[in-house]
Interface confidence: medium
């Protein structure tokens, strides 16, 4: 593994993909989505210590300034680097429609 | 302003662009950057309450699940939506070079 992928806080504690099982009710979608009934939501969760999966130069700057001014500048944050698409079948006035969302499920994560 | 741009926590408390004045030493760049000597670093700082500058569907999901499971799912995070380029004059083995970085200064912010 690259140095930037080795978590200094211990296994699984740093920024990585997690799966959270959610119903349409959990998501607040029950009134407009028919299918799927349940979603395995993949999202990015975990700490972003120095040099861990830094997305870009901005993340490096942010970490350096966070160490200098922790009360002013927050640490980088674990967010999706890319997404997986998902199709939802939605209720419409006339019946149902097929809609693909490209920004719904996280595919991989980095620190920004 | 759109509803998603009105901060319910009070003016300036939600996710927005901040400017932090930093020297090359602050940034850890003193050994490889010649110019500029100081940088007005623009970065995204602030809270991401419900419906505030949600970047996409994923951010909506994350907020809904955060409200349900706050110990498991963190709230969305304030990160750059786009960047401004910046030119650095760098030291090289043979002298100096001009390098443009496209991912250094945040241009605007959203919640993911």
């Amino acid at each position: 593994a690259r140095n930037g992928d080795r978590c200094p806080l211990g296994p699984g504690r740093c920024c990585r993909l997690h799966t959270v099982h959610a119903s349409l009710e959990d998501l607040g979608w029950a009134d407009w989505v028919l299918s799927p009934r349940e979603v395995q939501v993949t999202m990015c969760i975990g700490a972003c210590p120095s040099q861990f999966r830094e997305a870009n130069m901005h993340a490096q700057i942010k970490m350096n300034l966070h160490r200098l001014k922790p009360d002013t500048v927050p640490a980088p944050c674990c967010v999706p680097a890319s997404y997986n698409p998902m199709v939802l079948i939605q209720k419409t006035d006339t019946g149902v429609s097929l809609q693909t969302y490209d920004d719904l499920l996280a595919k991989d994560c980095h620190c920004v | 302003a759109r509803n998603g741009d009105r901060c319910p926590l009070g003016p300036g408390r939600c996710c927005r662009l901040h400017t932090v004045h930093a020297s090359l030493e602050d940034l850890g760049w003193a050994d490889w950057v010649l110019s500029p000597r100081e940088v007005q670093v623009t970065m995204c700082i602030g809270a991401c309450p419900s419906q505030f500058r949600e970047a996409n569907m994923h951010a909506q999901i994350k907020m809904n699940l955060h409200r349900l499971k706050p110990d498991t799912v963190p709230a969305p995070c304030c990160v750059p939506a786009s960047y401004n380029p910046m030119v650095l004059i760098q030291k090289t083995d043979t002298g100096v070079s001009l390098q443009t970085y496209d991912d250094l200064l945040a241009k605007d912010c959203h919640c993911v």
Partner: antibody
Framework: QVQLQQSGPELVKPGASVKLSCKAS????????INWVKQRPGQGLEWIGW????????KYNEKFKGKATLTVDTSSSTAYMELHSLTSEDSAVYFC???????????WGQGTTLTVSS | DIVLTQSPATLSVTPGDRVSLSCRAS??????LHWYQQKSHESPRLLIK???QSISGIPSRFSGSGSGTDFTLSINSVETEDFGMYFC?????????FGGGTKLEIK
Amino acid sequence: QVQLQQSGPELVKPGASVKLSCKASGYTFTSYDINWVKQRPGQGLEWIGWIYPRDGISKYNEKFKGKATLTVDTSSSTAYMELHSLTSEDSAVYFCAGTYDPAYFDYWGQGTTLTVSS
Amino acid sequence: DIVLTQSPATLSVTPGDRVSLSCRASQSISYYLHWYQQKSHESPRLLIKYASQSISGIPSRFSGSGSGTDFTLSINSVETEDFGMYFCQQSNSWPYTFGGGTKLEIK
């Protein structure tokens, strides 16, 4: 594990109707959609339609409107497809397919062979 | 309706060969294309979703690529169990449509 068990082969006369079944097990029936797909001998696959088991909402390929009727019985975790006014063109293998993400077909039944002949 | 055209109709190969199967859409479908394998007298089996995403339990020798109108399913070292029919399917819009299939046979 997810399983879809389809009813046995059918031999029916032209003009008649037939009702094919697809019994689901290994998962919560209302959590997955059921699609029906037609395959004629030596030919490709045709999507017939989709049904949402929780409340029976369905969507049909226009080509099969009036030909196929999709229903579900949640108490027995079974999906049904009734085919009407049968002709030799309806002779085919019919598959039910369960989908989690409604874009593609994760789980398939073994297929039911329908022969329409006098 | 979106028409998917698969080529070649038949592909004769030797085990160990690397093969590429093509699927072309009549209009852009982004990457909303999925691949299935069907052996004789069996049900189809999902191999690849969304043009290039792998499916749990499917051997890593199967891979997919492409977007827009042109897609490819690759098998990097064909095994005897891989012979059969291969179909592509689009989910860009209803009605879902399938390609006519490519038959992979032993040379």
